[in-house]
């Protein structure tokens, strides 16, 4: 049914879906705080621009009676139930923030005539790619895939002189929501990653992973997995690892590697960690003070979602344009706006661009050090440490196939 939008006459409302099923086990109060802090900033920015308007958020809570798993497994219908709630109340804002689960976002996008923008902190899966009115403020799987292919092909760096074409992917089904969709994308036979690799096998059992570490007949030296150092330790423990094994640990939303006094444990020496560059001041900001290192990005995405709406609202109001039009709904892409902690860039499809950072463990200092950065916006790798103190022979990353000569 046609739902009227509270989005005119100087009063602009944001509908925030507060779903029990969420991409991260974050208490709703941290998201509530993020939204409200974002609103304060937006009001200030609009006021400074001479725009005397009201901006508010309406939090839409799930009743939680049916969809009680607390994770994304039962989120498909929860999102639709909340939309039905909005529809019944005839109360829709100018923009919808949430949901974060890929299942629910995909279903909501499919089952609604979206004449309003949807901003998501999550929705990592490939099934949410290329959606015309969906904006994703946390790195989706497609961005990860493009980095990996780029890095695999790279062979002209002092520390990486071989291009790679093989990989194992460890995926045991217990992953967090972000990891689940990242690994799902790598596993998919039709994905860009699979298309570009000559050999790729998914390891689903702990024992399979453990056996590969010392298997002389392994088909690749490279293993991709997703999670934090503790997750790796549970799996690998203190087992011996062949000297030319490289583990790529995808841990995008975890700032702990950059915190002071963090020492890399010994089991991380064969590991390259892929994470996101932390914001300039986010580690010490009042906003993130009450958040654990793995949760900052999620709450920040909610906050930045509010700031993005404020940015678009300002542009449209200054141009005298209507907010409740398809033009507004399709405008949340191919732009840069001022986020909480600096500029945030969205690509042509409304997905956030970021700087990914590949870290290694220095054998000298036992500290995490930046090996290279990757700009998802231009799909380009920038080496940082030209002479890394690797554990690998000659301080170079090994070939991906044992015994194969230079490419």
């Amino acid at each position: 049914s046609q739902v009227s939008q509270n989005c005119h006459n100087g009063s602009y409302e944001i509908s925030v879906l507060m779903m029990g099923n969420s991409a991260f086990a974050e208490p709703l109060k941290n998201l509530e705080d993020a939204v409200n802090e974002g609103l304060e900033i937006v009001r200030g920015r609009l006021q400074n621009a001479g725009l005397n308007v009201t901006v508010n958020a309406t939090f839409m809570y799930s009743d939680g009676l049916i969809h009680n798993s607390g994770d994304c497994r039962s989120s498909t219908c929860e999102g639709l139930d909340l939309l039905r709630k909005i529809s019944n109340a005839q109360r829709m804002g100018c923009v919808l923030i949430g949901p974060s689960c890929t299942y629910s976002t995909f279903q909501m996008y499919l089952d609604t005539e979206l004449s309003y923008p949807m901003i998501s902190a999550g929705s990592f899966g490939l099934s949410c790619d290329y959606k015309e009115t969906l904006t994703r403020l946390m790195s989706p799987a497609r961005k990860l895939m493009y980095f990996l292919v780029n890095f695999w092909k790279t062979n002209d760096l002092p520390f990486k002189t071989y291009s790679w074409s093989t990989s194992y992917v460890y995926k045991n089904g217990t992953e967090t929501e972000d990891c689940f969709w990242y690994l799902n994308a790598l596993e998919a036979s039709v994905s860009y990653f699979s298309h570009e690799l000559g050999f790729k096998v998914v390891l689903r059992q702990d024992k399979e992973f453990q056996d590969i570490l010392m298997d002389h007949n392994r088909k690749s030296n490279v293993i991709i997995m997703c999670g934090g150092p503790e997750f790796l330790y549970k799996l690998k423990g203190d087992r011996a690892v062949a000297e030319d094994i490289v583990i790529i640990l995808v841990d995008l939303f975890n700032d702990q590697y950059f915190e002071d006094n963090v020492t890399a444990p010994d089991y991380m020496k064969n590991v390259l960690v892929l994470t996101l560059s932390p914001g300039n001041s986010l580690l010490n900001s009042s906003f993130s003070r009450n958040l654990s290192p793995t949760k900052r990005d999620f709450a920040l995405a909610y906050l930045n979602g509010i700031l993005l709406f404020g940015h678009m609202l300002k542009i449209f109001l200054e141009n005298g344009e209507n907010i409740t039009t398809p033009k507004f709904a399709h405008a949340f892409r191919n732009l840069t706006f001022e986020g909480y902690d600096g500029p945030v860039t969205l690509d042509d499809w409304g997905d956030v661009d970021s700087t990914m950072v590949l870290l290694y463990t220095s054998v000298d200092t036992k500290k995490y050090k930046v090996l290279l950065t990757y700009d998802t916006h231009v799909n380009k790798t920038y080496p940082v440490d030209m002479s890394p103190t690797f554990t690998w022979k000659n301080s170079k990353l090994p070939n991906d196939i044992t015994g194969r000569g230079p490419q």
Partner: antibody
Amino acid sequence: CQSVKESGGGLFKPTDTLTLTCTVSGFSLSSHRMNWVRQTPGKGLEWIAIITHNSITYYASWAKSRSTITRNTSENTVTLKMTSLTAADTATYFCAREDSMGYYFDLWGPGTLVTISS
Amino acid sequence: AYDMTQTPASVEVAVGGTVTIKCQASQSISNWLAWYQQKPGQSPKPLIYRASTLASGVSSRFRGSGSGTQFTLTISGVECADAATYYCQQTYTNNHLDNGFGGGTEVVVK
């Protein structure tokens, strides 16, 4: 030593406005969420309001229309103002700090008794 | 609203016995639940947070468990000093609340 202490309790008349102050020491208000909780005689705990480290405020649904929570970081105080008092507001009012991760209320004041009677 | 229902309202237990208090959330709060002990004339004292983590200085006789909507506080080897009222509290949301605390359970030690 970290502490919180409530003041401003006493005897009030129905329709009066109540202003309670929570004075904190040994920690910064900009690092913690601060709460007001009350307990009517012989009854359970009832959450009233919270102010976050960024001065964002939330209220229990029953308290929203007649309560205001504010803070003064330079004076290390958190204030609760409640209007249109009735006999049902007779209670001991506690100020409580939420721990830095938001897990629980880790520091409580001794409470201040508020009695509403004509 | 995220309502918390505590049972029983009152329970008697002999010294050395075990008491179990239940707390139910009207919808999932993951493990964002705390337990408090309050004695007459005193302010509440934190016992457990994140459903199962003991607060500083609390005896290991107190044990919290559960997640989602069902939670339990178990006191084993009950002592006279455990006579008090116990409250559960959700710490999951601030914005959608009538209260946040359960109704309380009075533990009487015989």
